[in-house]
């Protein structure tokens, strides 16, 4: 039985230009994490393997960094950016979890970071 | 030890079949994304196809030439990668080699010792 | 299809700075890599990602990838870098290999 719940860092804003750290967390469970994949409307941005390391997608290697953690870095962003992204863990014996994050990349300097939120 | 080591080539009628294998041992295979590439006498490497780790869907991607005809997958459990070949053509005569993809620093670029595939009436 | 160019042949002096182009639309929008290979042998993997050197691989080699050309260097070219160069253009839905470069040590 799936006991985790994945908590992130839920809506988000960004200016253009700018960076912003996508995370989540795996909590309520005592599975072990062995893969997470972070992905942005089925194109896979980077992988995050807990015995082989990480791998950033080629089309991403430019603007995007590893961490902090399990988390990735977006940077040198676009209104192109916008859109949801999802942390998929791969977890023992649990099975998958997958977060949701959604990015708005505002032209303004007014850009807010949104409330967390928990996906079960 | 770290290795792949390929089996199953042979000589094989035009419209035939073969199966080739791929015996993984020394690293975490399951992860991996793995890919057969082949060389035909004389001439340079052709991507064949390949198959993503199940945690990252394991799908398959192909070359055209081969696409329809042949197909990969894996057996983690088994450590091993295949390669069916069907209705095969004079033209896939080559050596098959496996190779993982280079997806992580710590697991790139290995290569076995290929395997040669003659296809002759 | 997506298709990769190198020059055929090339030589070098020892001692001299090799630099072997690949060249394929877009290509800095994937990862560039090269292997090399002797008569007879495996392919061996020389360079990943673009500008990675696997462990074991001399320093003399390293690449670059930018734009829609890769390179491969090799500086202080010696007598046992005679050999076929392959670039490989590499991402999550592809991979291509360059027709391979011939590189006479003279």
């Known amino acids: 039985m799936m006991t985790g719940t994945i908590e992130t860092t839920g809506n988000i804003s960004a200016e253009k230009g700018g960076s912003i750290i996508l995370q989540c967390h795996l909590s309520s469970t005592t599975a072990q994490v062995t893969q997470v994949n972070w992905e942005q409307q089925d194109q896979l941005l980077a992988i995050c393997n807990a015995d082989l390391g990480w791998h950033i997608s080629p089309s991403f290697k430019d603007r995007v960094a590893p961490g902090p953690g399990l988390g990735l870095t977006l940077q040198s962003l676009t209104v192109n950016d916008t859109g949801e992204y999802f942390c998929i863990y791969h977890t023992y014996p649990d099975g998958t979890y997958t977060g949701r994050i959604f990015l708005e990349v505002l032209e303004s300097s007014v850009a807010e970071h949104g409330a967390r939120f928990q996906i079960p | 030890e770290v290795q792949l080591v390929e089996s199953g080539g042979g000589l094989v009628k035009p419209g035939g079949s073969l199966r080739l294998s791929c015996a993984a041992s020394?690293?975490?295979?399951?992860?991996?994304?793995m890919s057969w590439v082949r060389q035909a006498p004389g001439k340079g490497l052709e991507w064949v196809g390949r198959?993503?780790?199940?945690?990252?869907?394991?799908?398959?991607d192909y070359a055209a030439p081969v696409k329809g005809r042949f197909t990969i997958s894996r057996d983690d459990s088994k450590n091993t990668l295949y390669l069916q070949m069907n209705s095969l053509k004079t033209e896939d005569t080559a050596v098959y080699y496996c190779?993982?993809?280079?997806?992580?620093?710590?697991?790139?670029?290995?290569w076995g010792q290929g395997t040669l595939v003659t296809v002759s009436s | 299809s997506y298709e990769l160019t190198q020059p055929p042949s090339m030589s070098v002096s020892p001692g001299q700075t090799a630099s072997i182009t690949c060249s394929g639309d877009k290509l800095g929008d994937k990862y560039a890599c090269w292997y090399q290979q002797k008569p007879g042998q495996s392919p061996v993997l020389v360079i990943y990602?673009?500008?990675k050197r696997p462990s074991g691989i001399p320093e003399r080699f390293s690449g670059s990838n930018s734009g829609n050309t890769a390179t491969l260097t090799i500086s202080g070219t010696q007598a046992m870098d005679e050999s076929d160069y392959y670039c490989q253009a590499w991402d999550s839905s592809t991979v291509v290999f360059g027709g391979g470069t011939k590189l006479t040590v003279l």
């Open positions: 020394g690293f975490t295979f399951s992860y991996a994304w």
């Open positions: 198959i993503k780790s199940k945690t990252n869907g394991g799908t398959t």
């Open positions: 190779t993982t993809d280079p997806l992580y620093d710590i697991l790139t670029g290995l």
């Open positions: 990602q673009d500008s």
